[in-house]
């Protein structure tokens, strides 16, 4: 039988999503945060 709760808040329960990681420091060293000079 199909036991997984499938429609809680419209999304399957038990399915782990995988977001893309965010790197706010962009092209700088991970310890620094600087936006390109054109801004």
């Amino acid at each position: 039988s199909y036991s997984m709760e499938h429609f809680r808040w419209g999304k399957p329960v038990g399915k782990k999503r995988r977001p893309v990681k965010v790197y706010p420091n962009g092209a700088e060293d991970e310890s620094a945060e600087a936006f390109p000079l054109e801004f």
Epitope: V20, K21, G26
Partner: antibody, heavy 115, light 110 residues
Framework: QQQLVESGGGLVQPGGSLRLSCAAS?????????MCWVRQAPGKGLEWIGC????????YYPTSAKGRFTISRDNSKNTLYLQMNSLRAEDTAVYYC???????WGQGTLVTVSS | DIQMTQSPSTLSASVGDRVTITCQAS??????LAWYQQKPGKAPKLLIY???TLKSGVPSRFSGSGSGTEYTLTISSLQPDDFATYYC????????????FGGGTKVEIK
């Protein structure tokens, strides 16, 4: 300063294959990063092609890219790859590699599919 | 699959104008949304992530808001350097086609 440099673009005939490279400097690809490929057809918008978790090697693709496109990495060369097969005219685009969601993108490499 | 619908596709404005760009997701993306600016012949630059977090160094005239499926990028007072194309991107779920871009909004001089 972290940098990404793509190469390998050029003219290819329909049905052909091409492998693009993305050389990273200023950071080590073998650390766990999400590295992605995005393309942009001439005069059009951005299209996500897929990403690789450089730690595990797990890859993720949109439905449109599954089957024809393969992302890989060579940790010893600190380089990311995009293998493209069965190329079509509509694959003509500038191909960018990017470090996850960030401002760290390469300059792009143009792929032209034409006979 | 998550679709991102961005509007308008083109926006004509003048320096000093308040500009608003919207992005609608086909499902709840829980604020996993980024905004990029792109100029001709250049790679995109990240402006905002987490729907509303301004990247360090980005001018405060840029702001992002929204939740659920509706998101907005606002430029409070348009500057000459801001004429460019803007894209939203969700990064909600790579495993389920959930890293797609909106179609883009070109902000041009009126």
């Amino acid at each position: 300063q972290q940098q990404l440099v793509e190469s390998g673009g050029g003219l290819v005939q329909p049905g052909g294959s091409l492998r693009l490279s993305c050389a990273a400097s200023g950071f080590t690809v073998s650390d766990t990063y999400d590295m992605c490929w995005v393309r942009q057809a001439p005069g059009k918008g951005l299209e996500w092609i897929g990403c690789i978790d450089t730690g595990s090697g797990d890859t993720y693709y949109p439905t449109s890219a599954k089957g024809r496109f393969t992302i890989s990495r060579d940790n010893s060369k600190n380089t990311l790859y995009l293998q493209m097969n069965s190329l079509r005219a509509e694959d003509t685009a500038v191909y960018y590699c990017a470090k996850g969601v960030s401002s760290l993108w390469g300059q792009g490499t143009l792929v032209t599919v034409s006979s | 699959d998550i679709q991102m619908t961005q509007s308008p596709s083109t926006l004509s404005a003048s320096v000093g104008d308040r500009v608003t760009i919207t992005c609608q997701a086909s499902e709840d993306i829980e604020s996993d949304l980024a905004w990029y600016q792109q100029k001709p012949g250049k790679a995109p630059k990240l402006l905002i992530y987490g729907a509303s977090t301004l990247k360090s160094g980005v001018p405060s005239r840029f702001s992002g808001s929204g939740s659920g499926t509706e998101y907005t990028l606002t430029i409070s007072s348009l500057q000459p350097d801001d004429f460019a194309t803007y894209y939203c991107q969700t990064y909600y779920d790579m495993a389920d086609d959930g890293a797609s871009f909106g179609g883009g909004t070109k902000v041009e001089i009126k």
